[in-house]
Every structure is written in structure tokens, then in C-alpha cells.
Interface confidence: low
Amino acid sequence: ECVTQLLKDTCFEGGDITTVFTPSAKYCQVVCTYHPRCLLFTFTAESPSEDPTRWFTCVLKDSVTETLPRVNRTAAISGYSFKQCSHQISACNKDIYVDLDMKGINYNSSVAKSAQECQERCTDDVHCHFFTYATRQFPSLEHRNICLLKHTQTGTPTRITKLDKVVSGFSLKSCALSNLACIRDIFPNTVFADSNIDSVMAPDAFVCGRICTHHPGCLFFTFFSQEWPKESQRNLCLLKTSESGLPSTRIKKSKALSGFSLQSCRHSIPVFCHSSFYHDTDFLGEELDIVAAKSHEACQKLCTNAVRCQFFTYTPAQASCNEGKGKCYLKLSSNGSPTKILHGRGGISGYTLRLCKMDNECTTKIKPRIVGGTASVRGEWPWQVTLHTTSPTQRHLCGGSIIGNQWILTAAHCFYGVESPKILRVYSGILNQSEIKEDTSFFGVQEIIIHDQYKMAESGYDIALLKLETTVNYTDSQRPICLPSKGDRNVIYTDCWVTGWGYRKLRDKIQNTLQKAKIPLVTNEECQKRYRGHKITHKMICAGYREGGKDACKGDSGGPLSCKHNEVWHLVGITSWGEGCAQRERPGVYTNVVEYVDWILEKTQAV
């Protein structure tokens, strides 16, 4: 059962796994949630009645029964991990802690104008986990305005002490705010020969890379495949680091693969969710339970529903045995990974899907694209919404994209003459406009946030957010699209689609069925040549065929230019403007979303 509230002056007795230091009980709960085994925790707040060396301790706990006896203790705050909950979880922590010094290895010291600048520096430094900033009121003159970047083995402070006139905080890498490059390449036949900080067992290089990504100290990894000559090292995933942040030495070796942590792009790719099945593979670990199951999919469901289960092995039934049910072995380990991986025994193994909620919902695979044709099918573009105005009569106004459970991203120019959000209705999961009747459910709009530098579509900043009055429950027909990663600025997208109910030619009408068109991106240089009277800025992105014929048009405005990259759909552009529709050598111009990621996150994550 999901318990979110914190229990004040309460301590859980026993079940200790480990003790870390956190600046708040709230963050202690997050650390517990991300720990492979933690189900409960007890945090000690600062208090005159408590020994200062115990202040800010966060004791992570586990229990077979999923609960522990409660004891009354002043300054203790206890609670449960969010593993038991179904809601989305994020490690993003933007809080700034005043008069707290978070201890770690101070590996970089520099002058900064503000705590915010110090936090940005930490976010854009590959090694930085957290920082402490001495304000200009700090007593010691030579330490004023000093920004200390820190890291530790665990990613959490080794101690936290009270210190006047300093502030501390965490890197915002997990908030998708880092400008560090997102390097997705996996290099075959390659060993990175740098120092190992940890090693785990993994069934393939992709799982190894994901484990590296959420390990606080891992910057890159080497994985030895099951064909690796040295038997004792098969399926071994080595988590690595180096002073420079890059591999210093690499060796060519067959049957080894290496790659980088995906920390800088983790909001737009699955990191915790290992959804594949591994055939003829047995995962070894501590056995939690053995249950009968009809299939390996059913076994995975059982593991996902058992809060302590981390991975499983399913052995199919022998012919006509046990009503055709096989054995489902639910397992766990100290680090969430199998202790050993064996091949050739006929088992089918996999991981719990419970951790998938720690990934951004937008990374979930959607149904395959329908190739050919121009009309979409239901569920093909689940982030696409139709924005209606009810004044003077109800009609489709613009497209938009779901980017969060309360947020729609669209174009600013859609709101010319819109006096109030009250006249707006957002319909999601719609394929045909004719589905929209008086009793069709919709989302009311609480707030329209237009970029404050917007003047007109052609001069840029054509971007707006709609905050919905109620939250969207994600389903197959309505779910978010990922924002592009700032670390992905160099990516060349080759599979891009524009969608909408807009006109099919300049003098036309709104279409009933959601239309789609695959459109190639055009370089800004090329686009500028086609629009000599306009300035095509880096905050715009263009797409279209040289010969014309396919394009967005009136009524598509605000809708998505969606591009598929590494099996994940990204909102690369927002339909903005163009000269006519689908004209020869007149590409469509879209708002370049990657350039507005900071603005979007600032507005949507505002407290």
C-alpha cells in the first residue's frame, strides 16, 4: 500500500540497511525510493534534544513484512519509500538549504556570483553531486562567494553540519537541466581500462548502461558479453570513472562493449526500466518466493506486484504438468542485480517493471507507426491534443502536445485575441473531430503562459504552455511526448512527422481525421535562403520537401513536429509559420523546442 505522508516524532525500530546523510526528510524519502532494497526510513532532524552528530541522518530500512514497529522519538521523522506507490517519481531536487554545509570531496573551488550560478556549475560538471556556496555575508573574507563542487561515492553527503551564511544544494542533472553531452554510442569490441568503482551482473550492454546511468559515480562502463573468453567475467558490468570524466585508455577486445552514462539524457530515455525478457537465461539471487505462472509475462507481473521482487526467472512447465503452469522464481539481491547469470538451462528471466515509474512516462513505447497514408489511427500520436475555443462558437483552434500530466505545449500565436483561459477546452485521445460532442470530457485551462519575448510568430519565441485545471491520467491514447535533451543538440533527426487537423491546402477547412505527414528537417542555412525577408534564428527549426507537397497548414499551428530517435519520440518542433502551405522551396518553420527546454522546465517545475 502507498503511504506518502511522513510520521513526525516517530522512529522505525530495526531493519537497518545503511545510513546516509540528507538535508531533509523529504529527500531521505527520495533516497530510500531509489535504493534497491529500502522500503522504510527514519530521518533525524536538527533538534536541541538530539546529539548533533545524529542530525540529518537518514537510516534506510527493509522489512519482509513491509513495515516495522514504531517507537516515539522527538526529532525523528519516518516514512515509506515511494516504491509502493504507482505515481511518477523523480530524483530532481531543486531545494536550496540555508546554513547547511553538505560534506563531500571538495574537488573544485571557484568564485560564483550567486548560489544559482554555483548550482548551474555543479549541474554542468560531470563529477558534481552537490555543492556548498559561501554567501557574501560569510565571516571569512577569503571564502566569500566561493562555490565548492563536491562528490561522494554514494552521491549523498558524508556528513551535514550547521554553518552560518552558507547554502547547499544538489546538481540538477536529474531535472534534465544539464548541458553536458548526451553520448548514446555503445562501442563494440572495446574495453575502457579506467578504474572500476563497482561491478554488477547484467544480461546485456543496454542494462549495464542503464545501471551506470543511475549509479552516482559511474561515468562510463565496460560490459563483458556471454561469449567473453574468461568464464568468470561473463555478463560482468564494470562501472567506471576517471579524473577527466572520459576514458583515458581503451583496449580493442572482442566480445566486450563499452559506453557512457546517459545521465545527461535520462529524462528522455528509459534508465530504470529493463523491460526485455532474456531467453535461456537464469538470474541467480536471494529467493523471495516460488509461484506457479502461465507464462514469463505473467511471472514478470507477479514480480512487479511484489514490492521486494527485483528480478525473476521463469521455468516453463514440462508437458501437461501443473495445468500447463511453469515455476516463477521471484528474487532479490543487495544491489538489485542478479548475483550470477547462467545460460543454457532453459529459464526465461527479466526484471520488475515497478521501477519504470522512475523513468519519464514519455519514454514508454507506443504502438508501431502506420506506414503510408495520411490519416492517422487511434493511439498513433497519443500526445497530440486538439485545443478548442468556445467563443463565439466552439471550434478547433490549434494543436498542442501533452508534455506532463498538467501541461500542454503549443504555439503563442494561437492565443491572439483570446482574452481568458476560460474559453479554452483541451481534448486528448481524439482521432476524429466528429467525436467531440457536448458531453465529451475535456480539460479546462487554468493558465496560459506565453513566452514574454513573443511578439509575432515570424520573429520567434512562438511558444506557450497551458496549465490544465485537472491532471491527465495516462493511457494508450493520451500520454506525454519527451522533450529533446539539451545534451542532444547535435542529433540529426531523420524520422520526423507533423500532425494535425489543419487545412490540406491553403483554401480548405479543418479536417475531421488527424492527418500525418513525414517531413525531412532542413538546415537553418538552407531555410534562410528560402526566407530572405525573415531572420531564421537558431531558436527555429525548418522542415519540408524541396518540391513542396507535404507541410503543416492553417489549423495545425501549435501541434507537434515529432521525431523518433533511439525508439523514443521527441517533441522537436512546434508548428509555427511558413509562406503558404506545402509550397515549393518554402519549408515550414517550427519553434525549436530544445532551445526552450530551460524555459519549459522553469515554468512547469515552479513551486
Epitope: 563494440p188 572495446t190 585508455t249 583496449i251 547535435n490
Partner: antibody
Framework: QVQLQESGPGLVKPSETLSLTCAVS?????????WGWIRQPPGKGLEWIGS???????YYNPSLKSRVTISVDTSKNQFSLKLSSVTAADTAVYYC???????????????WGQGTLVTVSS | DIQMTQSPSSLSASVGDRVTITCQAS??????LNWYQQKPGKAPKLLIY???NLETGVPSRFSGSGSGTDFTFTISSLQPEDIATYYC?????????FGGGTKVEIK
């Protein structure tokens, strides 16, 4: 067909920084591969300076590491070399080159620029 | 760093002769070795990769062999256009290193 073209000053004063750019045509740097710099002092052999991946990952020769910076500008489809505190020993023909395979690390230099001679002299 | 020792440093042969150049690595580099040809005033050109594979478009008179530390490059029948300096290059470990080169001339 991939073409690489080095450009930059042919004469650099001692202790200054040598700066060269390699313009790539016929292929988008962003699409992958390692892009490298190799030099050859007059009448001598080849020396690898360093290489860069489109995403910004760099590898440098340890003998030059403290003085070398290689960077990539995907918007201009070019990559650059900066070598600081130069001496007469840095006089060489500087070549830019592209690796042969996209999936592996630096292996075979398949495509080369024609080279540019940089002389270090006061 | 891995040292690559090429020998001879220069040789002179007649048209039609079989020419052999050797390259020795200071440690085992498996087959991670390439051979290049450099004509005067030109950039090097990749001839052989992975010790023995002929690059596309390179005449079949050029060949390579070897593994571990000892490698051989052969021109089965020397042609006038083969006048050049030949270099071996290892890519087993960074930094990438080249041999000192072998200058081939026609008698």
C-alpha cells in the same frame, strides 16, 4: 564523397597558439565517426595528435595532452585543433582525417585532408 | 605507449620485384594494425586494415599478414607508381602510434 580541408595560418610565433580548422563536406559530422588530427614534421614520420567524436568525446595523445584542445562545431560541419605554447618542434604538416568505421573507436584513418604546413618561427 | 619498429627504413628494388616490409610492435596488438602509403607531397592513403584486409579500390598486389607483435607488408610485383613511403599503425591501445616509415625506391 567525403572531403576534408584544413585551414589556418601557415606561420605561428613561438609560445603562441596554433589554430587550425578542418571543414568537412559530403558528410555530416553529427552522423558519427571519429575525426582526428595527425601531424608530420618535415622529413619525419606521422604522429597522432587526437580525435573527437561528433558528441564531443575527445581522445588526445598523452605527449601533447596538456597543450591540445580539439573541438567540434556541428552547425558549421567542422572541427578544430588548438595547440598552445608552440615551439619550433611543432613545425609540421598538419592533417585532419576521418575514421573508417562509425561503430568503433579510432582505428583506421580512411579519409584525409591534403595537409597544411605550419611553421613555428619568430 | 606502444612502439612500432619498421624495417628497413628504406629499400631500392626493380620493377616487378617482390618487396617485403616488416613492422614489430613493442607488445601484443592482436591484429589491430593498418598499413598506409604516402606519396611525396600527398596525404597518407589507407591500404590494409586489420593486418590483412585490403581496403576497397587498392590493387591486389598489396597484402599484409601477421598477428601479435610481428607483421609483414608485401608488394608482390613492384610497379613504378608504388614509389612512396609506407607506414604501419597500431590501434590496439591509445595513443595510436605509427612506425617510422619505409621509403621504397626503384633501382
Amino acid at each position: 564523397q567525403v572531403q576534408l580541408q584544413e585551414s589556418g595560418p601557415g606561420l605561428v610565433k613561438p609560445s603562441e597558439t596554433l589554430s587550425l580548422t578542418c571543414a568537412v563536406s559530403g558528410y555530416s559530422i553529427s552522423s558519427g565517426y571519429f575525426w582526428g588530427w595527425i601531424r608530420q614534421p618535415p622529413g619525419k614520420g606521422l604522429e597522432w595528435i587526437g580525435s573527437i567524436l561528433h558528441s564531443g568525446v575527445t581522445y588526445y595523445n598523452p605527449s601533447l595532452k596538456s597543450r591540445v584542445t580539439i573541438s567540434v562545431d556541428t552547425s558549421k560541419n567542422q572541427f578544430s585543433l588548438k595547440l598552445s605554447s608552440v615551439t619550433a618542434a611543432d613545425t609540421a604538416v598538419y592533417y585532419c582525417a576521418r575514421d573508417r568505421t562509425t561503430v568503433s573507436l579510432i582505428e583506421y584513418f580512411q579519409h584525409w585532408g591534403q595537409g597544411t604546413l605550419v611553421t613555428v618561427s619568430s | 605507449d606502444i612502439q612500432m619498429t619498421q624495417s628497413p627504413s628504406s629499400l631500392s628494388a626493380s620493377v616487378g620485384d617482390r618487396v617485403t616490409i616488416t613492422c614489430q610492435a613493442s607488445q601484443d596488438i592482436s591484429n589491430y594494425l593498418n598499413w598506409y602509403q604516402q606519396k611525396p607531397g600527398k596525404a597518407p592513403k589507407l591500404l590494409i586494415y586489420d593486418a590483412s584486409n585490403l581496403e576497397t579500390g587498392v590493387p591486389s598486389r598489396f597484402s599484409g599478414s601477421g598477428s601479435g607483435t610481428d607483421f609483414t607488408f608485401t608488394i608482390s610485383s613492384l610497379q613504378p607508381e608504388d614509389i612512396a613511403t609506407y607506414y604501419c599503425q597500431q590501434f590496439h591501445l591509445l595513443p595510436i602510434t605509427f612506425g617510422g616509415g619505409t621509403k621504397v625506391e626503384i633501382k
